[in-house]
Interface confidence: medium
């Protein structure tokens, strides 16, 4: 709205940098062939690039990425009894970010 | 995968708490009737509840919310010239979070 402006602070741009985000661990990451199980924990923290850039045609992109394997529980329910197994999920953390030029989409030929 | 487990740390649940997120200021928040303008900054930081809960049937929800008005620039392009105006956008910050019971979905009658 273009209403009362007196108490409003100037909005500060959310700069392009890494922030802590919540990543949901989908079952497909662990087993694409079977859906009869649960994953624990269901979500973890990851570092991801986010924010805006000062110019158009640029986007906040990671310039350095690190893969981080973590152990989760794969809980299969078999005949009303849980079977716990360890599974490894590889998370992607962004270590550094940059406002990078977005390559123009190539025309379809 | 259930592959090599040696270097993987146990995954820690992303607990239910406030985290800094990037909120995109859409033009609709400022003027629903006109699309012929830009907003600056295009995005800002807000505090939002995120994460997972230890139990079933509960969700991470805000228990305390604060509205925060901020000033943005509304940049209208009139005859190829920019006209700057001030606009106020009200952001919503989450101050506290809790894992709250999700009410069972009512059956459609």
């Amino acid at each position: 709205s273009l209403g009362s402006l007196t108490i409003a602070e100037p909005a500060m741009i959310a700069e392009c940098k890494t922030r802590t985000e919540v990543f949901e661990i989908s079952r497909r990451l662990i087993d694409r062939t079977n859906a009869n199980f649960l994953v624990w924990p269901p979500c973890v923290e990851v570092q991801r690039c986010s924010g805006c850039c000062n110019n158009r045609n640029v986007q906040c992109r990671p310039t350095q990425v690190q893969l981080r394997p973590v152990q989760v529980r794969k809980i299969e329910i078999v005949r009303k009894k849980p079977i716990f197994k360890k599974a490894t999920v590889t998370l992607e953390d962004h270590l550094a970010c940059k406002c990078e030029t977005v390559a123009a989409a190539r025309p379809v030929t | 995968s259930l592959g090599s487990l040696t270097i993987a740390e146990p995954a820690m649940i992303a607990e239910c708490k406030t985290r800094t997120e990037v909120f995109e200021i859409s033009r609709r928040l400022i003027d629903r009737t006109n699309a012929n303008f830009l907003v600056w900054p295009p995005c800002v930081e807000v505090q939002r509840c995120s994460g997972c809960c230890n139990n079933r049937n509960v969700q991470c929800r805000p228990t305390q919310v604060q509205l925060r008005p901020v000033q943005v620039r509304k940049i209208e392009i009139v005859r190829k010239k920019p006209i700057f105006k001030k606009a106020t956008v009200t952001l919503e910050d989450h101050l506290a979070c809790k894992c709250e019971t999700v009410a069972a979905a009512r059956p459609v009658t």
Partner: antibody, heavy 120, light 106 residues
Framework: EVQLLESGGGLVQPGGSLRLSCAAS????????MSWVRQAPGKGLEWVSY????????YYADSVKGRFTISRDNSKNTLYLQMNSLRAEDTAVYYC?????????????WGQGTLVTVSS | SYELTQPPSVSVSPGQTASITCSGD??????VHWYQQKPGQSPVLVIY???NRPSGIPERFSGSNSGNTATLTISGTQAMDEADYYC?????????FGGGTKLTVL
């Protein structure tokens, strides 16, 4: 204060029955799986039985299968262990313990235990 | 049925490092927890999910688990650490405890 308080132990003859109770307080009982663990005099810990948050999953150690029944009343914040056909080797301190998740996991809170003695 | 094997006793001098092992077939495929029990008291969780410490447990307690062996390590052992220690793992529909290790601080 978060705590578990067992009761119902005592002296019983072989072949007899006992019902143990575990009253939970200080946490949302209905959200967590629970277990019974026992310890014979001078011996180690032995897991006895488990029940999930809503009671839909239950399982037992082979040594008690068919004789013991675990149950819970979430409205009363209470866990139970019905013990039938008791044997001398069931003599032990019985602990109720809480898991941190609905499905199980480690045992992060233990009661003080109640002694069951099976003897003629 | 699955078995977890622990040494019956381990001795350590104050200030030294104590290591208690727990072995079982492919134990590294399961999450291992460790419990401390002092005479006349209920067990207390000291390590969960192989290597995590619950709040309130001193930093000198640590754990690892790979292959067929899990290890509880107590660095800078204190007299107050003298107790029985039990490993535990959830395997094949049942919680299994090791036989326990009596830690003596000389």
């Amino acid at each position: 204060e978060v705590q578990l308080l067992e009761s119902g132990g005592g002296l019983v003859q072989p072949g007899g029955s006992l019902r143990l109770s575990c009253a939970a307080s200080g946490f949302t009982f209905s959200s967590y799986a629970m277990s019974w663990v026992r310890q014979a005099p001078g011996k180690g810990l032995e897991w006895v039985s488990y029940i999930s948050d809503d009671g839909s999953l239950k399982y037992y150690a082979d040594s008690v299968k068919g004789r013991f029944t675990i149950s819970r009343d979430n409205s009363k914040n209470t866990l139970y262990l019905q013990m039938n056909s008791l044997r001398a080797e069931d003599t032990a301190v019985y602990y109720c313990a809480k898991h941190p998740y609905w499905y199980g996991g480690q045992l992060d809170l233990w009661g003080q235990g109640t002694l069951v003695t099976v003897s003629s | 049925s699955y078995e977890l094997t622990q040494p019956p006793s381990v001795s350590v001098s104050p200030g030294q490092t104590a290591s208690i092992t727990c072995s079982g077939d492919s134990l590294g495929s399961y999450f291992v927890h460790w419990y401390q029990q002092k005479p006349g008291q209920s067990p207390v969780l000291v390590i969960y999910d192989d290597s995590n410490r619950p709040s309130g447990i001193p930093e000198r307690f640590s754990g690892s688990n790979s292959g067929n062996t899990a290890t509880l390590t107590i660095s800078g052992t204190q007299a107050m650490d003298e107790a029985d220690y039990y490993c535990s793992a959830f395997t094949h529909n049942s919680d299994v405890f090791g036989g326990g290790t009596k830690l003596t601080v000389l």
